[in-house]
């Protein structure tokens, strides 16, 4: 988002709207409240990073997320017998995923479009609502799913049922959180006509009035209540992980448990490195300085940011993976084109000795795994 | 070089309309906006209204209704036109070239027309 | 609407001094505020734009300064063609010019 000049002479109107009942000149229109951007702003927005670059990385983001998100609901749904913790919260971020990444197709025919929206004001808030959604929602989502992992290995034994039901109640939480902290998303006037480019922006541009405390204020605590707290409580959830499994015993199963636990880690360490700290960190430096100075000299690079973090949807199917067996087994099969059936038949046929020698927990049936380490 | 060149004086009668012209050289319409400001006897300088490269336009508060602004790409010229006019219109009208960002000023100037609005 | 204050009215200085005119604005503009000179029977030149640019062809005796909402041309030495009333306009939200500052000769 970058500032928006309101040039109403009513006084600062948050509303720039766009009056096409008023003297329609030539091929133009007579605006009623006008916001102007600067410069290096305009470029942006009619630049190659915001028509290209953005529509690419959201294409790939959408062809990724949405089928491997959309089947890791389906497993985590009905696929998987036993609802352990790790599932919900997993079932939760695919949710989260799936729920931002449907409105994709709107959002990169908005790029390719010279950023000019045309879907209307509801939409708009809906897209950027459900983008801010994602981002903290798989935050917390995640956070739990660490501290879960690492509470498993240090209590390995524990009531499901009871385990389960504060999974549930912690996830309703969160989206009830989420659903809070995003309203000023929602109420916000997203969309903003740009005279001086012929587009209508949905969220690039927000009215000056706005951004100078409020967004500044509102990104600032979101980053810090939403974003450096659970990602304290996830590194540490990982230190302390990788702490016990390095002084735990090591023979086949566990040297499994470890190497999948330091995939798992690298997994959500590279989502933090590429999707949330970039991000979340630009977001306040941002508005900083359209606090400070009226305009931002780091607003590329803040839309890059913003455009990377969408690929946490991308990356957390490997989550999935390095977690859950169910998820595993039915991506391994998706990709080859199997059925799960035939892959059982087979392993049953053919390596039932080999089995014999597993532990249960590590079982390939897909519908019989723990999904614990 | 950069030119703004505005019509000659014009003397109207109260509740008339005037249009004043402002041919560009040097520049293309397309790619810049021009800004219209007037300035009464002995007062300061008032901003009117703007009309951007891509015909799209907005007129300040004081103006709307009675303002418009044109622009015709094919001879580079802006025109400003104000109806109903008053004892009060008569000043001097200037057009003024901005490049149509925030971050822009108002560089180049036509010379003035005076428009005497008088029974 | 953003109103901008001009002060002193007039300026009576001799060639060669130091003029320093100020313009406050009611509210922050950051750095949207350009600086005008126009002389009797001509149309207004740009001095000074974004607080402190100087404007194409003007010469380095003429400076801006400040941010926010107080703002300063200052003319280090006054030449004879100085003498002049200058104009700030503000465009950070809307358009709006001081009410000017006539700089006459002592």
């Known amino acids: 988002t970058i500032q928006g000049t309101n040039r109403s002479s009513k006084g600062r109107s948050l509303i720039g709207k766009v009056d096409g009942t008023s003297h329609v000149t030539g091929k133009g229109v007579t605006v009623e409240t006008v916001f102007s951007v600067d410069e290096f702003s305009a470029s942006v927005l009619t630049g190659k990073l915001t028509t290209v670059f953005l529509p690419i990385v959201y294409t790939i983001v959408f062809v990724v997320g949405l089928p491997s998100n959309g089947m890791a609901l389906w497993v985590f749904l009905f696929r998987t017998k036993k609802k352990h913790p790790a599932v919900i919260y997993m079932a939760n971020l695919a949710l989260a995923d799936l729920l931002s990444v449907i409105w994709f197709p709107l959002k990169i025919a908005y790029h390719i479009h010279g950023n000019n929206w045309i879907y209307g004001e509801a939409l708009c808030n809906v897209l950027i609502g459900f983008f801010y959604g994602n981002m903290y929602c798989s935050i917390l989502f995640m956070t739990c799913l660490s501290v879960q992992r690492y509470w498993v290995i240090v209590n390995p034994m524990g009531h499901s049922r009871k385990k389960a039901n504060i999974a549930i109640g912690i996830s309703l939480a969160i989206w009830l959180l989420i659903l809070l902290v995003t309203i000023p998303l929602y109420v916000v006037k997203q969309t903003i006509f740009i005279p001086a480019l012929n587009i209508t922006t949905c969220h690039d541009v927000l009215p000056e009035q706005l951004l100078v405390g409020d967004m500044f204020n509102y990104f600032l605590s979101l980053a810090i209540g939403v974003f450096l707290f659970p990602a304290f409580l996830t590194a540490s959830a990982y230190v302390l992980m990788i702490r016990m499994l390095r002084s735990s015993a090591m023979d086949e199963n566990s040297e499994k448990k470890r190497k999948r636990a330091i995939k798992l880690i690298v997994t959500v360490l590279a989502m933090y490195l590429i999707c949330f700290t970039p991000s979340n960190l630009l977001l306040v430096v941002h508005y900083f300085l359209i606090k400070s100075q009226g305009q931002s000299h780091v607003y590329a690079l803040y839309i890059v940011a913003l455009c990377l973090s969408t690929l946490n949807s991308c990356i957390d199917p490997f989550v999935y993976y390095f977690v859950s067996h169910d998820f595993r087994d039915h991506a391994k099969n998706a990709l080859l084109c199997r059925s799960v059936r035939t892959v059982k038949q087979m392993q049953v046929s053919l390596t039932s000795k080999k089995h014999s020698r597993k532990s249960s927990s590590y079982s390939s049936s897909s519908t019989t795994v723990k999904t614990s380490y | 070089q950069v030119q703004l060149v505005q019509s000659g004086a014009e003397v109207k009668k109260p509740g008339s309309s005037v249009k004043v012209s402002c041919k560009a050289s040097g520049f293309s319409l397309s790619s810049y906006g021009v800004i219209w400001v007037r300035q009464a006897p002995g007062q300061g300088l008032e901003w009117m209204g703007v009309?951007?490269?891509?015909?799209?336009?907005y007129y300040a508060q004081k103006f709307q209704g009675r303002v418009t602004i044109t622009a015709d790409e094919s001879t580079s010229t802006a025109y400003m036109e104000l109806s109903s006019l008053r004892s009060e219109d008569t000043a001097v009208y200037y057009c003024?070239?901005?490049?149509?960002?925030?971050?822009?000023?108002?560089?180049?100037w036509g010379q003035g027309t005076l428009v005497t609005v008088s029974s | 609407e953003i109103v901008l204050t001009q002060s002193p009215a007039t300026l009576s200085l001799s060639p060669g001094e130091r003029a320093t005119l100020s313009c406050r604005a009611s509210?922050?503009?950051?750095?949207?505020l350009d600086w005008y000179q126009q002389k009797p029977g001509q149309a207004p030149r740009l001095l000074i734009y974004n607080t402190n640019s100087l404007a194409t062809g003007i010469p380095a005796r003429f400076s801006g300064s400040g941010s926010g909402r107080d703002f300063t041309l200052t003319i280090s030495s006054l030449e004879p063609e100085d003498f002049a009333v200058y104009y700030c306009l503000q465009h950070n939200s809307g358009w709006t010019f001081g009410g000017g500052t006539k700089v006459e000769i002592k």
């Open positions: 009309i951007w490269g891509n015909g799209n336009t």
């Open positions: 003024a070239r901005w490049r149509g960002y925030k971050d822009y000023p108002f560089d180049y």
């Open positions: 509210q922050n503009i950051y750095k949207y």
